[in-house]
Structures are given as structure tokens and as C-alpha cells.
Amino acid sequence: ELCDDDPPEIPHATFKAMAYKEGTMLNCECKRGFRRIKSGSLYMLCTGNSSHSSWDNQCQCTSSATRNTTKQVTPQPEEQKERKTTEMQSPMQPVDQASLPGHCREPPPWENEATERIYHFVVGQMVYYQCVQGYRALHRGPAESVCKMTHGKTRWTQPQLICTGEMETSQFPGEEKPQASPEGRPESETSCLVTTTDFQIQTEMAATMETSIFTTEYQ
């Protein structure tokens, strides 16, 4: 089941998926001046079985000005965006896929890829949040969001992250400790069945992830 909405947006923060659940779609978008090759895939799809997951289809772009098919070259990382106006300054360094059955890694860039990556997430997907460059976490509770099915509708849980500018008059008495994952606040809808998957990554991962996997600018 696809999630209806984008993950929540938090001022001066960005989110990143560490891995993508089977069923996730990534649009094949080309940068300006390029287009998908004729009969090329509209999207990549994370598929697999119990032991292995991978992206079906390959995105291919060709110049809008020529009718040549695109050259197959080793893709180079380039700026990406993730279903919102947050720019990806460096490619994601995925966690070991073996530890996340039923999930795909970040797909490698393709030649002449658009600067925006548009993902269509599925129920059970988890994304992690971090303050962008120039901001730091004033408060970090559970800094992730999960797409859940509630009352037949999908919704994202709310990440608890407040980012403040480094120049603002905040007081930071001590450096943040890695955040353990508590049970969280009851949601207003919890009177009925909530279905989600058993996908759980240690929340410590969110607190200790390399900054390079997150965006470094967001305005």
C-alpha cells in the first residue's frame, strides 16, 4: 500500500531513508534538456523475495535534442532531491542490506538524472531526520517517522526534532547523547487497529548517522 502523503517536514531539517521497503517506486526523471528513452521505464520498483531485494527496471535518459539512445556509463553521483525541495549534496551511504531483509539500497544515480528524486513510499517505510548545515538539534526525541496504516488511511508518525540556528540565542548545557527509542506518545487514532511492519532499525542509528547522508542545505 502506497503512502498517501510525503513524510512530515520539519523546519531546517531533512529526512533520509536508510533503505527502501519492497514496493517503493522511484520516478525515472531526467534533468533539463534530457528525457527518458523511448520505451524506457517510468519508474524503478523495489522488488524481491525473502532473501534478496533489488530495483527492477533501469532509468535511462537521452538528450532531448537528439534521437540517440543514452550511453551506458558508470553513473556519477550528482545532486539529488527526495520528494521535497531538499537538495542532496552527497549520495547516501546505505546500511548493510543483509541486515534489512525486504528492503532495497539507495539506487545508484543514472546518467543525466534529474536533481529531484521522487519516491513513492509504502506502508512501513521509516525515514530519519537531521538538522541541516548551520542548524543543530535543540531537541531530539525519536527523530524518525514511519508510514502507518490507520483506519484504512495512511499517515506518517511525527518525528520529534527541533532545529535551531547556530547563531540563535539557544543554550546547550551539554552535548546530546544518542537517543534511545522510547515508546512515544499515544496517537489520537490508537483506539483502532494500527498495522505496520516489523521494520525496526535501532534508533541509535539515527542519532549516529554520518552527516553525509543528509542534505546540507534547506531553505
Epitope: I10, L138, Q158, Q160, S170, G184
Partner: antibody, heavy 118, light 107 residues
Framework: EVQLVQSGAEVKKPGATVKISCKVS????????MHWVQQAPGKGLEWMGV????????NYNQKFKGRVTITADTSTDTAYMELSSLRSEDTAVYYC???????????WGQGTLVTVSS | DIQMTQSPSSLSASVGDRVTITCKAS??????LSWFQQKPGKAPKTLIY???RLVDGVPSRFSGSGSGQDYTLTISSLQPEDMATYYC?????????FGQGTKLEIK
């Protein structure tokens, strides 16, 4: 059920200090930051500051010129707001409110009236 | 600090009327704007967040719109229970700042 229960009304003299408590129940205290908001009689809302209940980080509205101090006691799931050097214009209702991801104030305390009078 | 200019400061309307309240920020606040309703003697209640997203349980007659510096709260068909004071809040930057409020009365 989520509840934020504030301490009772206070009457203070100018120059004194008031400390209001906000006791939380129904959720994990350290997950959610706590804000404090002032509302003078017949006036609008003024954000005073916020504390991370997780790590004690704070951010204050400079309008209060260093007179406000927000603290949190994780052993009792209670947040506190202390306002010093009170003056008559500090007569107001003070609210605690939690910050919930996409929007800052989803749960509020019932409010505490502080009257500053000589 | 970001200034929030809310207008009108008060208005009177009839049941069934369409009512509009506006808020203008002194700079772009990236749609990080909430609308609150406050009734006398009560704590404020969030109606809208992120400029246009309705909080669960809030009647659909309430809607929000806008981007950049200019935002609007609309009540499509005014009900007697909507008599209250309404505030906008920007939460893009610290310090968070509220509009001055709009007192809505029923004719």
C-alpha cells in the same frame, strides 16, 4: 490520556520571582519539548521559550531579557518556568504546551494566573 | 524577530457567512504557520498547521492557504460555536511569534 497539569494561581509583589510547574502524564516526558506561552489579560499570546526535556537545551524569547528560566525534572516528569524581577505587566496567564513534530503546540496545560501587585 | 501582522483585529459575521482572516509575515516563513482558536478562559487549540493542513478532529469548514509571507484562514460557513479569537503563529524561526489575534463575533 495525555495531560499537562499546571500549578495554581500566584500573587506576587513587584521585584519578586515566580516559579510555575507543569506536570506531564500520558506520554514519555523526554520525547517532547516543552514550550511556555504568556497571555496578559485581554491581550494576545507571546511565546516565552522552549526546553528540550531530553537534554535540557533551551531557547528563550529575548523580549523577556534574561528574566525567564525554563527547566525540566525528568525524575518527576515536570517542567518549570521561573520569571524573575516581576513587574505589573507580567500579570498574565502562563501556559505550558508540548511540541509535536509538525506543529508546535498540540497539548496545553490549563494555564496559571500570576498577578503582580503591590 | 519575525513580525506577524494579523487582520482584521475584530470582525462580526452572520451564521453561514464565509469568513477570512489574514496573516502577513515580515519575511518568508516557508509555510511553517499554524492557526489557533481560543475561547474565553480556555487554552488555545490548533486548527491548521503547515499553512494548510487540518488537525484531526477539526471541522472541514476550516481551511488554510498561503505561502511565502501571506497566509489566510477561511471558515467556509460560520457556525455559532466558531465565536472565538483566532491567532496565527510562525514556527519557522525562533523566537516563535504570534499574530495579534482576530476576535470573531456572531451577528
Amino acid at each position: 490520556e495525555v495531560q499537562l497539569v499546571q500549578s495554581g494561581a500566584e500573587v506576587k509583589k513587584p521585584g519578586a520571582t515566580v516559579k510555575i510547574s507543569c506536570k506531564v502524564s500520558g506520554y514519555t516526558f523526554t520525547d517532547y519539548a516543552m514550550h511556555w506561552v504568556q497571555q496578559a489579560p485581554g491581550k494576545g499570546l507571546e511565546w516565552m521559550g522552549v526546553i528540550s526535556t531530553y537534554n535540557g537545551n533551551t531557547n528563550y524569547n529575548q523580549k523577556f531579557k534574561g528574566r525567564v528560566t525554563i527547566t525540566a525534572d525528568t525524575s518527576t516528569d515536570t517542567a518549570y518556568m521561573e520569571l524573575s524581577s516581576l513587574r505589573s505587566e507580567d500579570t498574565a496567564v502562563y501556559y505550558c504546551a508540548t511540541s509535536y513534530g509538525n506543529y508546535p503546540f498540540d497539548y496545553w496545560g490549563q494555564g496559571t494566573l500570576v498577578t503582580v501587585s503591590s | 524577530d519575525i513580525q506577524m501582522t494579523q487582520s482584521p483585529s475584530s470582525l462580526s459575521a452572520s451564521v453561514g457567512d464565509r469568513v477570512t482572516i489574514t496573516c502577513k509575515a515580515s519575511q518568508d516563513i516557508n509555510s511553517y504557520l499554524s492557526w489557533f482558536q481560543q475561547k474565553p478562559g480556555k487554552a488555545p487549540k490548533t486548527l491548521i498547521y503547515r499553512a494548510n493542513r487540518l488537525v484531526d478532529g477539526v471541522p472541514s469548514r476550516f481551511s488554510g492557504s498561503g505561502s511565502g509571507q501571506d497566509y489566510t484562514l477561511t471558515i467556509s460557513s460560520l457556525q455559532p460555536e466558531d465565536m472565538a479569537t483566532y491567532y496565527c503563529l510562525q514556527y519557522d524561526e525562533f523566537p516563535y511569534t504570534f499574530g495579534q489575534g482576530t476576535k470573531l463575533e456572531i451577528k
